[in-house]
């Protein structure tokens, strides 16, 4: 859990991930126009990738491409379109020195404010003390307790639970999500929500202040939804929303509720039936890995403004290659 705001370490600037296992390129001949500038003695322009700043997308960021494009036409500029997700975790700490050499001006430098503790509304400051296993790798932090910026996804592991939903997805309307109660009041809130119908199952968050509840019927769930914003126990305002966490629903569906409970329907005079078979397969409340991957996909979407240059494979060029060794 250490170091939420630390920039992810990418490969070193000089490393070439495509070198290993790649086919060797044709031997360069006398035609120097096919040689990249850095092989001809030119000083390469320093390229510093600029990750997305906290305050918003930075435009015109160039992606580093392999300089070893020998044997083809000169590389075309590739401009990535920024796929910014609102509320996505920042990749730069607000404590990093933004105006470091080579970075130029970013949106933050022009309007930096002193002592920013909470950036924008969704981000919440959580105090951390260096030396307690939460080192922030920042010289400014040494010996000073200060705020670590947590993204909503870090605060709430289900922040991205709706990201994987598509228009074709069918959500189970008998599930609701209840939130906003203190952890100590969870069982009390559960008692209250069992008044609105037969709860078959509920899944508690590991932080304890929200839960997914499955009712026996959609009608009962709708009744629970109508309690959104209601105050319980004089001081606890509760939110109730339809559950959008597919993983909880799907794992519950796999349990195959063979006999939904008819419990507490007074006219029926049968013995008590459980709402759940005892051999219920265990389900996990963690997000499926796929969700996590979807939430952390690349911030930059590469869009080439021209067709990618291909090596000329015509008969004439092959003859020229054979004759001149190009």
């Amino acid at each position: 859990m250490a170091a939420f705001a630390v920039e992810p370490q990418g490969p070193a600037l000089g490393s070439e991930p495509m070198m290993l296992g790649s086919p060797t390129s044709p031997k360069p001949g006398v035609n120097a126009q096919f040689l990249p500038g850095f092989l001809m003695g030119d000083l390469p322009a320093p390229v510093t990738p600029q990750p997305r700043s906290i305050s918003g997308p930075s435009v015109g960021v160039m992606e580093m491409r392999s300089p070893l494009l020998a044997g083809g036409s000169p590389p075309q500029p590739v401009v990535p379109a920024h796929k910014d997700k609102s509320g996505a975790p920042p990749v730069r700490s607000i404590y990093d020195d933004i105006s470091s050499p080579g970075l130029g001006s970013t949106p933050l430098t022009s309007r930096r404010q002193p002592n920013i503790s909470v950036m924008q509304s969704p981000l919440v400051g959580v105090t951390s003390t260096p030396g307690t296993g939460q080192s922030m790798f920042s010289p400014a932090s040494i010996g000073q307790p200060r705020k670590t910026t947590l993204s909503p996804a870090q605060l709430d592991p289900f922040y991205t639970q709706g990201d994987s939903l598509t228009s074709e997805d069918h959500l189970d309307d008998s599930w609701v999500t209840v939130f906003g109660f203190p952890q100590a009041s969870a069982s009390y809130i559960l008692l209250q929500f069992a008044q609105y119908g037969n709860i078959l199952k509920h899944v508690m968050s590991n932080t304890g202040n929200w839960m997914h509840i499955r009712y026996q019927s959609k009608l009962q769930a709708r009744k629970a939804l109508s309690k959104d914003g209601r105050i319980f126990g004089e001081s606890i305002m509760i939110g109730v929303k339809p559950c959008i966490d597919k993983s909880v629903m799907e794992s519950s569906d796999r349990c195959a509720l063979s006999s939904p409970s008819l419990a507490f329907t007074p006219p029926i005079k049968t013995l008590g039936t459980p709402t759940q078979p005892g051999s219920t397969p265990r389900i996990s409340t963690m997000r499926p890995l796929a969700t996590a991957y979807k939430a952390s996909t690349s911030d930059y979407q590469v869009i080439s403004d021209r067709q990618t240059p291909k090596k000329d494979e015509s008969l004439v060029s092959k003859a020229m290659e054979y004759m001149f060794g190009w």
Epitope: A186, L190, A194, P274, T285
Partner: nanobody, 120 residues
């Protein structure tokens, strides 16, 4: 597999007492919560009393001081002692037990209910 069977209901005069029992056929001693609910004709279900996670108890305002919920883990039983019964206490009383099946995942079990009628 847990099944809940209630007993102890019946007809009683106003001011009288009844003791409801809910026996779990299966281990309910580790229950997360245990509660009694009631539903009167034409009314919504309401929580009467509950033993919350941690052992504290909760009572509806209308029964405070008159009803007492308790549990006997050795007998896998939850009780509801009802004193000074009033006609408005009439209804079907149902037992509800919540058991943690896996970490953070809880299964809910309901009894069929036992009818309590308080005549004036």
């Amino acid at each position: 597999q847990v099944q809940l069977v209630e007993s102890g209901g019946g007809l009683v005069q106003a001011g009288g007492s009844l003791r409801l029992s809910c026996v779990g056929t299966g281990n309910i001693s580790s229950a997360y919560t245990m509660a009694w609910y009631r539903q009167a004709a034409g009314k919504e279900r309401e929580v009467v009393a509950g033993i919350l996670n941690g052992g504290s108890t909760h009572y509806a305002d209308s029964v405070k001081g008159r009803f007492t919920i308790s549990r006997d883990n050795a007998k896998n039983t939850v009780y509801l002692q009802m004193n000074s019964l009033q006609p408005e206490d009439t209804g079907v009383y149902c037992c509800h037990v919540v058991i943690e099946s896996t970490r953070f995942v809880y299964d809910h079990y309901w009894g069929q209910g036992t009818r309590v009628t308080v005549s004036s």
